[in-house]
């Protein structure tokens, strides 16, 4: 059904990562545009991307007016210069994606490690707190601003001489942990949100090393 | 708990109007597009209205659009439809119900009757 | 319109049987379906939405498949309180229901 020659989107997909959102779909347009709608479960219906040959529409706008709403996206599908042209139904032809919630669903980030400072046998291990995309009071929040104690970070780390590796974890960005005199550590971090059933962990952060550039050492 | 309450019905003449309320409780009613659906006498369901949570969209059955009106009062937690010219084939149970996107029903009131009779 | 039709529109069965309800859309609706059971003089109550995913709160023994233009609704052990009136709805394009089902004892 619908306009003739048009065909529907399909494989509608949600790719987030830290908030950044974008829906992608297929297939790639022959002599057809699409338009992108977006909503929470109001049913206020907001377009976006207009008539585009893409097939793809970036909606981190709309998603982070509230990361805890639930959205739904709805693809139409119009004939190349005859974007008034309607379906069978009496409107043109679309399909929904699934549904998306980005506070429980957003991938997290791979996370960095700031730096990482020892002061005796003690090292303090400080993760960068990334900024997102989500807005309150015209300021940008970082991932701990919105996941608040949702997220923990896991740090690994390890004897450069050794394959054994131990493992910390924190509900802020700081790690403090004992290692051995004179020897050096590699380090390596990945954020967690254990209350999630889906995408609870990040990808780990690049591993860093005492003796390169990040780390300070004081006795 | 998730209620709605519709209240307004009665017996109307035909060419008569009348104005049905739901009012709900246990959820943010601004959050949910809400909808009317009705069923008459020994017959199946019948969409009748739907509304967007702001209540900028508003959509209508063909068998009721320019005759019956959609409208809510977020501040008051309260769906409306305001039934003008009514005829005998829309006596029914009238049921207002919350409608995730506008799209689905997953809440439902225990519904109020419109006869419509001379 | 898309037109929704259900079959069979009676159904006597024994509790204990498994019931299949099938509903076929004019044009294809995808997976937007939903399946709702209604008792006498009471109000609908959602089953099923998105063809197959279980409301919460509703038993198990209710599932929902389908894709495209035909749908049904399983009933795996059918239970006294499973006693009523089933309709499907699509809302692919406005929305539209049924005919409905009603399932009687046997």
């Known amino acids: 059904s619908g306009t003739t020659n048009t065909v529907a989107a399909y494989n509608l997909t949600w790719k987030s990562t830290n908030f950044k959102t974008i829906l992608e779909w297929e297939p790639k347009p022959v002599n057809q545009v699409y338009t992108v709608q977006i909503s929470t479960k109001s049913g206020d219906w907001k377009s976006k991307c207009f008539y585009t040959t893409d097939t793809e529409c970036d909606l981190t706008d709309e998603i982070v007016k509230d990361v805890k709403q639930t959205y739904l996206a709805r693809v139409f599908s119009y004939p190349a210069g005859n974007v008034e042209s309607t379906g069978s139904a009496g409107e043109p032809l679309y399909e929904n994606s699934p549904e998306f919630t980005p506070y429980l669903e957003t991938n997290l980030g791979q996370p960095t490690i700031q730096s990482f400072e020892q002061v005796g046998t003690k090292v303090n291990v400080t993760v960068e707190d990334e900024r997102t995309l989500v807005r309150r009071n015209n300021t940008f929040l970082s991932l701990r601003d919105v996941f608040g104690k949702d997220l923990i970070y896991t740090l690994y780390y390890w004897k450069d001489s050794s394959t054994g590796r131990k493992t910390n974890t924190t509900h802020t960005n700081e790690f403090l942990i004992d290692v051995d005199k004179g020897e050096n550590y590699c380090f390596s971090v990945q954020a967690v949100i254990p209350s999630r059933t889906v995408n609870r962990k990040s990808t780990d952060s690049p591993v860093e090393c005492m003796g390169q550039e990040k780390g300070e050492f004081r006795e | 708990e998730v209620q709605l309450l519709e209240s307004g019905g009665g017996l109307v003449q035909p060419g008569g109007s009348l104005r049905l309320s739901c009012a709900a409780s246990?959820?943010?009613?601004?959050?949910?597009?809400m909808g009317w659906v009705r069923q008459a006498p020994g017959k199946g369901l019948e969409w009748v209205s739907t509304?967007?949570?702001?209540?900028?969209?508003?959509y209508y059955a063909d068998s009721v659009k320019g005759r019956f009106t959609i409208s809510r009062d977020n501040s008051k937690n309260t769906l409306y439809l305001q039934m003008n010219s009514l005829r005998a084939e829309d006596t029914a149970v009238y049921y207002c119900?919350?409608?995730?996107?506008?799209?689905?029903?997953?809440?439902w009131g225990k519904g109020t009757t419109v006869t419509v009779s001379s | 319109d898309i037109q929704m039709t259900q079959s069979p529109s009676t159904l006597s069965a024994s509790v204990g049987d498994r019931v299949t309800i099938t509903c076929r859309a004019s044009?294809?609706?995808?997976?937007?379906l939903a399946w709702y059971q209604q008792k006498p003089g009471k109000a609908p109550k959602l089953l099923i939405y998105?063809?197959?995913s279980l409301e919460s709160g509703v038993p198990s023994r209710f599932s929902g498949s389908g894709s495209g233009t035909e749908f049904t609704l399983t009933i795996s052990s059918l239970q006294p309180d499973d006693f009523a009136t089933y309709y499907c709805?699509?809302?692919?394009?406005?929305?539209?229901f049924g005919g409905g089902t009603k399932v009687e004892i046997k």
């Open positions: 044009q294809s609706i995808s997976s937007w």
């Open positions: 246990g959820f943010t009613f601004s959050d949910y597009a």
């Open positions: 119900a919350k409608a995730p996107y506008g799209y689905y029903m997953d809440v």
């Open positions: 709805q699509q809302y692919k394009s406005y929305i539209t």
């Open positions: 998105k063809a197959s």
């Open positions: 509304i967007s949570g702001s209540g900028g969209l508003t």
